[in-house]
Each structure stands twice: as C-alpha cells, then as structure tokens.
C-alpha cells in the first residue's frame, strides 16, 4: 500500500532505536570518512524530522522519498568536496541518479586504520558511561569499513555486542570474559560481510534473475518439504530485501526482512518443521535465526529427478512453454535432494542442464541427445569434491597458519601482479576455510568450503576491479559468478610475469616486530613470503621452506637477544644474503 509519508511509515514500523541505528549505518556506508560525531548529528536531525512526520504526515517535506531526504542531508555537509572529492559531484544530480552515484562511490577498501579493539577496561568504562554512544560507535566503525554490510544483520551483531559487554563488564577478569566472546562475534561478522558483498556483487553484475536463482537453490536445500510455489515466494521476497539493502534502501530492507520473518513464522507448516525455536525470539534474533536455520529433513519418498527432467517425453515442450519456470523447478528439485552440494555447484548443474536443453531441443532426436545429461554432471560434481578433499588434507597436515602460507604461495604464483597486502588478506581468508569447514561432517564440507571460497574470491575481485593489474584475475572475475572459484582453481603459474628484482629493504626487519601481537607477526612473515614468491615465482616448496624457516629463527633469536636492535641490524643482512643464495 502507498503511504503519504514513507519516512513516517518506516519509523512506526521499525521503532525509534532500530530506525536510528539503520540511519547511522546508511550514512556511515555512504560517507565513510566522516567522524561518528558528525553522523550522529545528522541521525538526530533525521529522527526528529521523522517524528514530526509521524505526528502529521502532511507536514512539509514528509512526502519526499527517503533517498531524497537522506541525499539532501548528505549534500548539505560542509566541506563535502574537500573530504570526498568527486563524490560531491553526485549532489548536482536528481534522484534516482544521485543515489546511484553515491552507491558507485562506496569504497570497499577505505583508507581507514584497521579497527583496534580497545582494552577490556576501557571498553567497559565507555560502555557503562553511555551504552548508546558505545554501540553507535560500533555500528559506525563496522559500517564505514564494510559499506555493503547487511544493515539489519549489523543491528543484530550490535545487540550481541551489547549482551557480551553487559555480561562481562561485571566480571572481575573482564578481558578473560570479553576476548573469546567478542572474537566469536567478530569472526561471524567478518564472514557475514564477505557473504553479503557477494550477494550485492551478484545483484549489481548479473541482476535479480541470477540472485533469485541463488535464493531458490538455497531455500530448496533448507526447506525440502516446501512446495515449489512456496520456495518461489520466499526467493522473490529475499531477492527484494537484498536488492533494497544493496541499493542503500536500508529502512525498507529491514522492514521487509521483519515482514518476511513474520510470514515464515505464520506459515511454518508449509515451510519447515525446524522454525519454531526461531519464531519465539524478538525480531532481530528471529530473522537471524531463520537465516541460519538448519536444513529440514528430506522427504523420504522423493522420486528420481530423471523422471520429470530426462525421461518425460514432454521435456522440450515444457521447457519451451516457460523456460524460467521449468529451469526453476529443476533447480528446486535438484537442490532439495542435495543439501550436501554447494549453491555454486547446484547453479552450475542447472546451467549445464539449460545448455543441454538449448542444444538438444533444436535437434532431430532430443530425448537421445539429453538422455545422458545427468551422467554429464559427474565431472562437475567431482571437481569441487576433489578440491575439498585435497585442501582439507593439506589443512590437517599443516594447520591454519601453514595452510594459509601454502595458499599464499599458490595465489601469488597465479597472480603475482596483485598487491602484496591484497594477496595476504585473500590468502589469510581463504586459509581460514580449513578451520571453518574441514572439521564439519562430510555432508556439510562441500557447501561450506565452496560457498565460503566463492565469497572470499568475490572480495578479491572487488578489490582488483578498483585497480586491475592481472589479466588472469580480470578474466576469472569477469565471467559468471558461479564459475569464478573453478576459474581461480584452474589458474597456474603466470608465465608472462617478469620477476620482481630483489630489494634488501623488503626483507629488512626491526625490533618492533617483537612486540606485535601474533596476528600482526604472521602478517609480516606472510608479506615477506609473498614478496619472495614475486622475486622467485618458480621457487620450489623446499626453497621457500628453507628461507621462511631461517627467517622465523632469525626473528625468534633477535627477539630474545639482550640488544634487539643490534641483533636485527647485524643479523638482518646475513639473512638477506643467505636467502638470496638459497633462492639462486
């Protein structure tokens, strides 16, 4: 239904607290460099205005679209051009072009310092002094670093943060209580960020149809007892919600997400037997719980997929009459039978099926032509299964850090032109797949591994798109989203690459490395490893092992020395000389 005042409608639906949080996220994702205090002023102004519209929907400007209202606020910021350069040009445009322009200026890799978690004592002091400001800062810090973070989900993580701080700040050892709990929230949130970025990439590059296909496959796996019509309705709603969030319509997105949760809880009988526990929770937790819900049990009496999609004499007729519906039905039927496959794999199979019908239905004897299609799926299924097997075996042998290093060597050889920080970030994230997925039961490994890798590779593509340097990466990133991971897996050493000359300063270290936290130490070592590979792309595993082992011993020795600075200064050049020799 149409509302006189969109902003009043959203304020009433969402409530003041969530409304303010979402407006803060929206502003932080659009203008990523502004300090919190500047944004919170705008949030308060927008909230006060929304309240006047709730009181009187006919009040001045209350009929304006939310994009218009938000855009006008952002464009009124003093010194916008000084701080944001050409983003200020967006302000000369009218809606909807102005919002599109803002979206195009979102920066996936903003020049912001990595967010350092404050000491437990300081967090608790500031949280207890002003919980609202503290959590506002959390929303701001995450949103500006992740401009596509799924806004209603970010509100959920802020709520989790609140719970953890409320619980831990009364403990005597605050740090012991906070650290593991906040680490767990952070890990989940970072994965959520890359997954959502992939959804927005899918929407931006390939449109709603591609995203809806993803949603059909995912929903069918989760809710195998639901009818195709029900799955289609859910997929359509999820597509609309994600389109809104990816497009910056955060209030509408959050409101629609709450509506979808309400619908699912009112229609459990036709969706899944597993929803009840989620449906007893408050709105943010309910939506999150539904998004993470375990798969329902597969119906026992499902017939073979071949009956309707290979053996039926009407296959070509059914396909010709309604291609999208027929392919959607195929995707639904195949996905509900295979919770053990990744969504990417299911979409590749559906694509293969579509290509087969396109070819065969134009031939003289279609059934003879498409009769072997299911057998032709076999290599497509085997490839990711082998990927999981070999990578999980390697992870089990090397552990997370060693596995990350193996991935880093592999990817630096595939795309040595990519900047070292980007390669290190990608390899560290790709390497975490072992910890995340390889410990799961067999049936859950493949979907976990492949869908996670796809999301991480999408991040690599997004960063590479900003400054393209590798033709191979561009090629893999330009193709279909579901073919990306196989494309990257198939890349070999880039033979066109001219090795980087050896620069001693790249491998010169100082005593400051000794006081770094373990994670930062690892990043320093991995940076050196990537640089070594760029210098010697064809170095053997043994050569790299020797040099990195030597390097680790050198750091260890000098960090234990009485005069650390002197040790680094004298032993460093020896290490460089030995490394050059080992790689000669």
């Amino acid at each position: 239904e149409a509302h006189k005042s969109e902003i009043a409608h959203r304020f009433k639906d969402l409530g003041e607290q969530h409304f303010k949080g979402l407006v803060l996220i929206a502003f932080s994702q659009y203008l990523q460099k502004c300090p919190y205090e500047e944004h919170i002023k705008l949030v308060q102004e927008v909230t006060d205005f929304a309240k006047t519209c709730v009181a009187d929907e006919n009040a001045e400007n209350c009929d304006k679209s939310i994009h218009t209202l938000f855009g006008d606020k952002l464009c009124a910021i003093p010194k916008l051009r000084d701080n944001y350069g050409e983003l200020a040009d967006c302000c000369a445009k009218q809606e909807p072009e102005r919002n599109e322009c803002f979206l195009q200026h979102k920066d996936d890799n903003p020049n912001l310092p990595p967010f350092q978690r404050p000491e437990a004592e300081a967090m608790c002091t500031s949280f207890q002094e002003n919980p609202t400001s503290f959590l506002g800062h959390y929303l701001h810090e995450v949103a500006r670093r992740h401009p596509y973070f799924y806004a209603p989900e970010l509100l959920y993580y802020a709520e989790k943060y609140n719970e953890v701080l409320t619980q831990c700040c009364t403990e005597s050892d605050k740090a012991a209580c906070l650290t593991p709990k906040l680490d767990a929230v952070k890990e989940k949130a970072l994965v959520a960020a890359v997954r959502q970025r992939m959804k927005c990439s899918s929407m931006q590059r390939f449109g709603e149809r591609a995203f809806k296909a993803w949603a059909v496959a995912r929903m069918s796996q989760r809710f195998p007892n639901a009818e195709f019509a029900e799955i289609t309705k859910l997929a359509t709603d999820v597509t609309k919600i994600n389109k809104e969030c990816c497009h910056g319509d955060l209030l509408e997105c959050a409101d629609d997400r709450a509506e979808l949760a309400k619908y699912m809880c009112e229609n459990q009988a036709t969706i899944s037997s597993k929803l009840q526990a989620c449906c007893d929770k408050p709105v943010l937790q309910k939506s999150q719980c539904l998004a993470e819900i375990e798969h329902d049990n597969i119906p026992a009496d499902l017939p073979s997929i071949a009956a309707d999609f290979v053996e039926d004499k009407e296959v070509c007729k059914n396909y010709a009459e309604a291609k999208d519906v027929f392919l959607g039905t195929f995707l639904y039927e195949y996905s509900r039978r295979h919770p053990d496959y990744s969504v990417s794999l299911l979409l590749r199979l559906a694509k293969k099926y579509e290509a087969t019908l396109e070819k065969c239905c134009a031939e003289g004897d279609p059934p003879a032509c498409y009769g072997t299609v299911l057998a032709e799926f076999q290599p497509l299924v085997e490839e990711p299964k082998n990927l999981v097997k070999t990578n999980c075996e390697l992870y089990e042998k090397l552990g997370e850090y060693g596995f990350q290093n193996a991935v880093l060597v592999r990817y630096t050889q595939k795309a040595p032109q990519v900047s070292t920080p980007t390669l290190v970030e990608a390899a560290r994230n790709l390497g975490r797949v072992g910890t995340k997925c390889c410990t799961l039961p067999e049936a859950q490994r493949l979907p976990c591994v492949e869908d996670y890798l796809s999301a991480i590779l999408n991040r690599l593509c997004v960063l590479h798109e900003k400054t393209p340097v590798s033709e191979k990466v561009t090629k893999c990133c330009s193709g279909s989203l579901v073919e990306r991971r196989p494309c990257f897996s198939a890349l070999t050493v880039d033979e066109t690459y001219v090795p980087k000359e050896f620069k001693a300063e790249t491998f010169t270290f100082h005593s400051d490395i000794c006081t770094l936290p373990d994670k930062e130490k690892q990043i320093k070592k991995q940076t050196a490893l990537a640089e070594l590979v760029k210098h010697k792309p064809k170095a053997t595993e043994d050569q790299l092992k020797t040099v990195m082992g030597d390097f680790a011993q050198f750091v260890d020795k000098c960090c234990k020395a009485a005069d650390k600075d002197n040790c680094f200064a004298t032993e460093g050049p020896n290490l460089v000389a030995r490394s050059k020799e080992a790689l000669a």
Partner: nanobody, 117 residues
Framework: EVQLLESGGGLVQPGGSLRLSCAAS????????MSWVRQAPGKGLEWVST????????YYADSVKGRFTISRDNSKNTLYLQMNSLRAEDTAVYYC??????????WGQGTLVTVSS
Amino acid sequence: EVQLLESGGGLVQPGGSLRLSCAASGFTFWPYTMSWVRQAPGKGLEWVSTISPFGSTTYYADSVKGRFTISRDNSKNTLYLQMNSLRAEDTAVYYCAKKLSNGFDYWGQGTLVTVSS
C-alpha cells in the same frame, strides 16, 4: 604506534589563561578515559584532571578546581585543558596521559607552562 602530542604551553602572567591541547593518534581514542598530569620543577608528578570517554564525567584535583576545565573532542581525537586564573604554583610541565585501570599506559612528551610576571 600510540602517540600523544601536547601543545599550547607558554609563558603567561598570573591571572592569565591558556588552553592546552593533546592530539592522540595510533589508537581508537573515544573509549579511553584521559587525564592531565603535571610536574613542577624539582617536584614529583601531580594528577590534575580526568575525563570519561564520552565526557559526561570529569574529575579535578582540589588545587585546580573551579579554575581548570578538561574537555575532549572525539571527532578530532583531541583532549583539552582550559586553564584560567593561573598562579605561579601552576608552573609545570603538563602531560596528557591515556588511562588504563589504576595507572597510565601512555604519556605525551609534555608542554611547559610558565606563570610569571
């Protein structure tokens, strides 16, 4: 790395005013309680004032109460100390410090305030 850089010190006559600033970098400023501490020539350290992370609570040593005002601008990562009605005994090097539990884990280099006619 963490840096605290004080500025605004100088020579001022008794009864005059000065405003000290402390620019913080290398850490997330807003969640930290911040303080000013001073050291008069030949004396030990003396705590002057403390401000809570969002500025809603301030504390002062009796010797400066009513004359000094501590404030902060979290958007600029800056701590301030407005000093009015200055006296000769306020002459000291003023340090800003990042507070942690019962002590301070980082100090600035200090800025010298001299009150003399």
